[in-house]
Amino acid sequence: LIIGFGISGRHSITVTTVASAGNIGEDGILSCTFEPDIKLSDIVIQWLKEGVLGLVHEFKEGKDELSEQDEMFRGRTAVFADQVIVGNASLRLKNVQLTDAGTYKCYIITSKGKGNANLEYKTGAFSMPEVNVDYNASSETLRCEAPRWFPQPTVVWASQVDQGANFSEVSNTSFELNSENVTMKVVSVLYNVTINNTYSCMIENDIAKATGDIKVTESEIKRRSHLQLLNSKAS
């Protein structure tokens, strides 16, 4: 969380951003909030990116003002217009690109003052893994697949019964480049699994950490997966 305070002029206002990550090819949100004003006409929101000459986005007098917008963001940005009046300056970024990573500034002017805060935005690819029993294999085998990751992640297997065990000798992980030549499909196979045990396939890079769990008993198979973004720090 980054909290910035205004400088000079009327009194300063508090602006708060949260470091976040964007999943390339999907829509992302750069989060920014500020002390609300009661009238829309005096609120100005400017998003800037370090190293970029033009603006990322500008909203003033109740409208988008995009005449100074940088070419790389053309047609890809929007504020949540109905939420501006309650202090939400967050920016929706469409079709996140790898090159969108960097330091952004959320700069706010209201009738009460000015303020700004920086935000670190990481970009990459992350997806939920799915763990299945591989019935084609000769021994009891689990297969963990996740369709899109970047940068290349690490894959670690764990088991509820054999806690702390190292499965690197009995697992094999491969990375297959997807058609757009950036993201990769992650496939990890775990051999010699035992019944009545819960196994976890953990995939992690510097942006996200995802886990796929599978519990195999004689009567049923239970699956669960979750994904967590790393380094969501407020500022």
């Epitope: 006409s41 109905d82 009046i85 202090g87």
Partner: antibody, heavy 117, light 107 residues
Framework: QVQLVQSGAEVKKPGASVKVSCKAS????????MHWVKQAPGQGLEWIAA????????DYNQKFKGKAKITAVTSTSTAYMELSSLRSEDTAVYYC??????????WGQGTMVTVSS | EIVMTQSPATLSLSPGERATLTCKAS??????VAWYQQKPGQAPKLLIS???YRYTGVPDRFSGSGSGTDFTLTISSLEPEDFAVYYC?????????FGGGTKVEIK
Amino acid sequence: QVQLVQSGAEVKKPGASVKVSCKASGYTFTSYWMHWVKQAPGQGLEWIAAIYPGNSDTDYNQKFKGKAKITAVTSTSTAYMELSSLRSEDTAVYYCTTTVAHYFDYWGQGTMVTVSS
Amino acid sequence: EIVMTQSPATLSLSPGERATLTCKASQDVSFAVAWYQQKPGQAPKLLISSASYRYTGVPDRFSGSGSGTDFTLTISSLEPEDFAVYYCQQHYNTPLTFGGGTKVEIK
């Protein structure tokens, strides 16, 4: 859930003052503007003023400057509006209302102030 | 100050009919308009914020549209509980101002 509970009805003599309270709960009182709105009998709605309890910033409708004074006590999450030099035209229902997720999304139940000799 | 003019002042309709309420601002207010419903003895209730965003729990027969100076609240098919007074309000500039209200009454 968000609630705004106002003080009870008041009957006052011309020239007197009255202080209406509005106790907020269910949200962070210091983070959102609190407004006061007047509705005279059979009439429409009229914005009086607003206060931002986080730093006590206020914004008044010029028409009500000198008539209304608004304050907020953050320790009790209560906003107040004092009306001075009361006249018959101040007879009205006064509402407190806040803007949490949308403009004027929560309202108090209203306080009837009657000015009569 | 920005003047909000509502029309008509009264709308006499039967349940099931469509109601169209209009609100005109004396200057451009972008999308900064909200609509409220008020019944006798009650506080106003928010229906539509920022010209077209239906507030949580508001039935989808209520819809708002417009930007700039001309705004509309539409009730697609009136239910008995919809007969009330409706106000528009701008939050583009201070003083915040309301329209004079439109009373929707049973024909």
